[in-house]
């Protein structure tokens, strides 16, 4: 299934790929050269390094296995933003085959509060919350190459879809009312 | 000028078009539909809602008449992401004829340092960032329809190009402990 | 030590006027956000009215807007409401309180209370 | 008619443990660990006992401790002593109208 990150919109290609027009994991070659490379897209760029140092993949769910860090400042001077933010977050790589970029970065909060500057510890009084970006994705599923229903194995039609990808986090006021 | 969010990566098209083929402000139609529609993209999206509410346009530097807002309780109850924040941002309208889409509603922090939770009042001890993420575009340039090294009047050339687009803020420790 | 002190309660007539005060001290009072809570004898505490640490914002609650007004001094440490159009209704101890975070219910610093009675 | 429901009394001997409810809605109590409790002593003014959820000011005995289930927090006090004996309130964000709401109060009655 693909991420539930926000209601996808999308636009279907019309054409019926065959698995030999296919290159393991690729998108038609006709629809990745008329658009940018989507390997510079962020959330793209950064699943090179995320697997070079062992990130986690997939679905497990948001602060799985996480805790909210604890601040100090003299760790964080030459530290990444999403280090240094006081609603840290961490990137995830989610996987998809249906989908080109099959692999994305994405970011989730390590903290549902945020943290203390003096403490370096959480504080409940405020809230992390993500920060969510749109990206433009292609997304297949299995079609007819012969006009019947039923779909031919190994044969794929596409459509462009913009999915909704939290790209970071940032610490809110809670927002509670009656 | 294209904006100085990043710097951008692109992909040439090889097709010179003339002005006929293009409607006022658009990119050829096959690039259109071969992709998601472009306003699904949340910097897209934001635009209408902005021009509606009379939003501050184009390239009035950061922080130009604004600051730091104070959100009053009774207030955070029921704002956005963007006022609700602890780093505060407002979207900015940026217009640009050469790509499309020629408007992208783009976030600029409204304070240096972050709201101080306990007070409501600017704390210099954090500091408020942007959280940049990439955004795929059409550029599009002059080009020659007849062969020479000269221009044709009213002919584009197109190539897709990402670039670094500030979707929000986030509040971070200094990377100085001066 | 920390402390808020109010003064000004007594007893008023119905629609008469009174003015209370909170005195602040041990503490950097330009720094916070303070309210007004008061307790009806007998019953709970019930809150009426915050002002900024700088004094430009103010907030009531619907059983005292329009009647009251709280302001403050910061460079003489002080806090005031004003109560016009005094009704049964107000009769209360009422408390000044510092608010550890400026948006939240925390309130780490109380005063003593000073009664208030409206009676004919 | 508060909009955060404590029961109107509980009561405790010495050494035991009471845990007093705060009932809110999912909005309010539900949504964030925002509650704060208050004791108060006959003739006195209330005192911060606990705030966001179950955090204690330095000063506060660590008997007393805060706790959230769902829509619903609560206050513990284990080892109950005599200077127990007091009413109880806990206090979250309200709407617009009233922004700040408190709970009813519950009375705790140290026996014996």
């Known amino acids: 299934d693909p991420p539930s990150w926000g209601k996808p919109r999308s636009h279907r290609t019309l054409r019926c790929y065959s698995a030999e027009e296919l290159s393991h994991g690729q998108a038609p070659p006709h629809l990745l050269t008329r658009s940018a490379r989507w390997e510079q897209a962020l959330p793209v760029a950064l699943v090179a390094s995320l697997e070079a140092t062992g990130h986690r993949r997939q679905h497990e769910g948001p602060l799985a296995g996480t805790q909210c860090p604890v601040l100090r400042p003299e760790e964080v001077l030459e530290a990444d933003t999403h280090e240094r933010s006081i609603s840290p977050w961490r990137y995830r790589i989610d996987t998809d085959e249906n989908r080109y970029p099959q692999k994305l970065a994405v970011a989730e909060c390590l903290c549902r509060g945020c943290i203390n500057a003096k403490t370096g510890r959480e504080t409940a009084a405020l809230n992390s919350v993500q920060l969510l970006q749109s990206l433009l994705v292609l997304r297949r599923q299995p079609c007819s190459r012969d006009g019947t229903a039923d779909p031919t194995p190994g044969s794929f039609a596409f459509h462009t879809e913009f999915i909704r990808v939290p790209v970071g986090c940032t610490c809110v006021l809670p927002r509670s009312t009656q | 000028d294209p904006p100085s969010w990043g710097k951008p990566r692109s992909h040439r098209t090889l097709r010179c078009y003339s002005a006929e083929e293009l409607s006022h402000g658009q990119a050829p139609p096959h690039l259109l539909t071969r992709s998601a529609r472009w306003e699904q993209a949340l910097p897209v999206a934001l635009v209408a809602s902005l021009e509606a509410t009379g939003h501050r346009r184009q390239h009035e530097g950061p922080l130009a008449g604004t600051q730091c807002p104070v959100l009053r309780p009774e207030e955070v109850l029921e704002a956005d992401t963007h006022e609700r924040s602890i780093s505060p941002w407002r979207y900015r309208i940026d217009t640009d004829e050469n790509r499309y889409p020629q408007k992208l509603a783009v976030a600029e922090c409204l304070c240096r340092g972050c709201i101080n939770a306990k007070t409501g009042r600017e704390t210099a001890a954090l500091n408020s960032v942007q959280l940049l993420q990439s955004l795929l575009v059409l550029r599009r340039q002059p080009c020659s329809r007849d062969g020479t090294a000269d221009p044709t009047p009213g002919s584009f050339a197109f190539h897709t190009e990402f670039i670094r687009v500030p979707v929000g803020c986030t509040c971070v420790l200094p990377r100085s402990t001066q | 030590q920390v402390q808020l002190v109010e003064s000004g309660g007594g007893l008023v007539k119905p629609g008469g006027s009174l003015r209370l005060s909170c005195a602040a001290s041990?503490?950097?009072?330009?720094?916070?956000?303070i309210s007004w809570i008061r307790q009806a004898p007998g019953k709970g505490l019930e809150w009426v009215s915050y002002?900024?640490?700088?004094?430009?914002?103010?907030y009531y609650a619907e059983s005292v807007k329009g009647r009251f007004t709280i302001s403050r001094d910061n460079a003489k440490n002080s806090l005031y409401l004003q109560m016009n159009s005094l009704r049964a209704e107000d009769t209360a101890v009422y408390y000044c309180?510092?608010?550890?975070?400026?948006?939240?219910?925390?309130?780490?610093?109380w005063g003593q209370g000073t009664l208030v009675t409206v009676s004919s | 008619q508060s909009a955060l429901t404590q029961p109107a009394s509980v009561s405790g001997s010495p050494g035991q443990s009471i845990t007093i409810s705060c009932t809110g809605t999912?909005?309010?109590?539900?949504?964030?660990?925002?509650v704060s409790w208050y004791q108060q002593h006959p003739g006195k003014a209330p005192k911060l006992m606990i705030y966001?959820?179950?955090k204690r000011p330095s000063g506060v005995s660590n008997r007393f401790s805060g706790s959230k289930s769902g829509n619903t927090a609560s206050l513990t006090i284990s080892g109950l002593q005599a200077e127990d004996e007091a009413d109880y309130y806990c206090?979250?964000?309200?709407?617009?109208?009233?922004?700040?709401?408190f709970g009813g109060g519950t009375k705790l009655t140290v026996l014996g």
């Open positions: 002002i900024s640490s700088s004094g430009s914002t103010t």
């Open positions: 309180a510092r608010q550890s975070y400026y948006f939240l219910p925390y309130f780490d610093v």
């Open positions: 041990g503490f950097t009072f330009s720094d916070h956000y």
């Open positions: 206090a979250s964000r309200g709407s617009r109208r009233v922004l700040y709401v």
């Open positions: 999912s909005s309010d109590v539900g949504s964030y660990n925002l």
């Open positions: 966001e959820g179950s």
